[in-house]
């Protein structure tokens, strides 16, 4: 979902908290994308965004093997990349960034998590000289409480995103439970 003209500017990183004392081993496993917000995310008038799942697997070098599984073109689509630890625990960059055409920077920051239920993660990238950012609300289950969703809306709005750039993907029967 790409609305690239007049992108909402990315917030300064000072506005994006970092989960203190991040435990990389506890963050491993499957997360469902329960909420999604960003300057290239736009609520459609018709069908909703479909839920997808992302699996974090810690490697020996402490980077993550990250696999997202989505339903696309009538089949399950797997998107695999590596998140390399950054300057501080809970912050990551994209491994082998040179293999992604047009991508010049990529930052991941775990904003908050309790590891066993929910997490909020901030992503920022520069691609084709355009700065994109998004926030994901992760859940260990496909449904989260209204309180957690409302907190996600508040946080997304604090980063300059209006309501129509904040969506809650619908759970689907395909792919995400594999």
């Amino acid at each position: 979902q790409d609305s690239t003209s007049d992108l909402i500017p990315a917030p300064p990183l000072s506005k994006v908290p970092l989960q203190q004392n991040f435990q990389d081993n506890q963050f491993q496993g499957k997360w469902y994308v329960v909420g999604l917000a960003g300057n290239a995310i736009l609520r459609e008038d018709k069908d909703p965004q479909k839920m997808y799942a992302t699996i974090y697997e810690l490697k020996e070098d402490k980077s993550y093997n990250v696999t997202s599984v989505l339903f696309r073109k009538k089949k399950c689509d797997y998107w695999i990349r590596t998140f390399v630890p950054g300057c501080q625990p809970g912050e990551f960059t994209l491994g082998n960034i040179k293999s992604y055409p047009g991508l010049t920077s990529y930052l991941v920051r775990v904003v908050s998590t309790n590891y066993n239920q929910h997490a909020m993660v901030f992503f920022k990238k520069v691609s084709q000289n355009r700065e994109y950012f998004k926030i994901t609300l992760y859940g260990r289950t496909k449904e989260l409480t209204s309180e957690l969703k409302e907190n996600f809306i508040r946080f997304s709005k604090s980063l300059g995103l209006p309501e129509n750039h904040i969506v809650f993907p619908v759970p689907i029967d395909q792919c995400i439970d594999g």
Partner: antibody
Framework: EVQLEESGPGLVAPSQSLSITCTIS????????IHWLRQPPGKDLEWLVV???????TSNSALKSRLSISKDNSKSQVFFKMSGLQTDDTAIYYC?????????????WGPGTSVTVS | DIVLTQSTSSLSVSLGDRVTINCRAS??????LNWYQEKPDGTVKLLIY???RLHSGVPSRFSGSGSGTDYSLTITNLEQEDIATYFC?????????FGGGTKLEIK
């Protein structure tokens, strides 16, 4: 003009399967989801399943094992099947068009088709 | 499952009245509440989505409000064509569920 119409068998024997077709006009099935719902006599409407524009589905988990949904975009038809019918599956069955993204509203409804399990 | 309760199953009304229909959810549904009208001939129409947003083509005499668990639909200056059954639906949590409906009847 947007229209939806259900066509079903009317009467189904217990333990048999129910098949209903929803034929739509005035819009494309590639762009909009189609829901199936039912209303048993004297009870609330019950949401059953939706097939989205991209062909993915979302089901009511309580009934998921009994439900099957598919579509033919070119024929503008959505096919609903429910197995193992019992008398409490007697209801009016509706198809409806999804609208307004994750607000999950249904803006156009078919007139419904009455199904009796007997 | 989230239960939606429309405590008034029928309401006696007069043309020109201001009518309010209530819907209570068994838990917070964060404004993900839609309202529908079912005419005596069985035709169902969407009126309001996300608590208060008027669906295209719906007359402005219809309005919605609420938050948390309590929601309402208001019809100001009731017209003959508004005599129907009104029901609510939540889109917050699967499975999406419906209220039992409130039927308007002329006094």
């Amino acid at each position: 003009e947007v229209q939806l119409e259900e066509s079903g068998p009317g009467l189904v024997a217990p333990s048999q399967s129910l098949s209903i077709t929803c034929t739509i006009s005035g819009f494309s099935l590639t762009s909009y989801g189609i829901h199936w719902l039912r209303q048993p006599p004297g009870k609330d409407l019950e949401w059953l399943v939706v097939i989205w524009g991209d062909g993915s589905t979302t089901s009511n988990s309580a009934l998921k094992s009994r439900l099957s949904i598919s579509k033919d975009n070119s024929k503008s038809q959505v096919f609903f099947k429910m197995s193992g019918l019992q008398t409490d599956d007697t209801a009016i069955y509706y198809c409806a068009r999804h609208r307004y993204s994750d607000y999950h509203a249904m803006d156009y409804w078919g007139p419904g088709t009455s199904v009796t399990v007997s | 499952d989230i239960v939606l309760t429309q405590s008034t199953s029928s309401l006696s009304v007069s043309l020109g009245d201001r009518v309010t229909i209530n819907c209570r959810a068994s838990q917070d549904i964060s404004n993900y509440l839609n309202w529908y009208q079912e005419k005596p001939d069985g035709t169902v129409k969407l009126l309001i989505y996300f608590t208060s947003r008027l669906h295209s083509g719906v007359p402005s005499r219809f309005s919605g409000s609420g938050s948390g668990t309590d929601y309402s639909l208001t019809i100001t200056n009731l017209e003959q064509e508004d005599i129907a059954t009104y029901f609510c639906q939540q889109g917050n949590t699967l499975p999406w569920t419906f209220g039992g409906g409130t039927k308007l009847e002329i006094k």
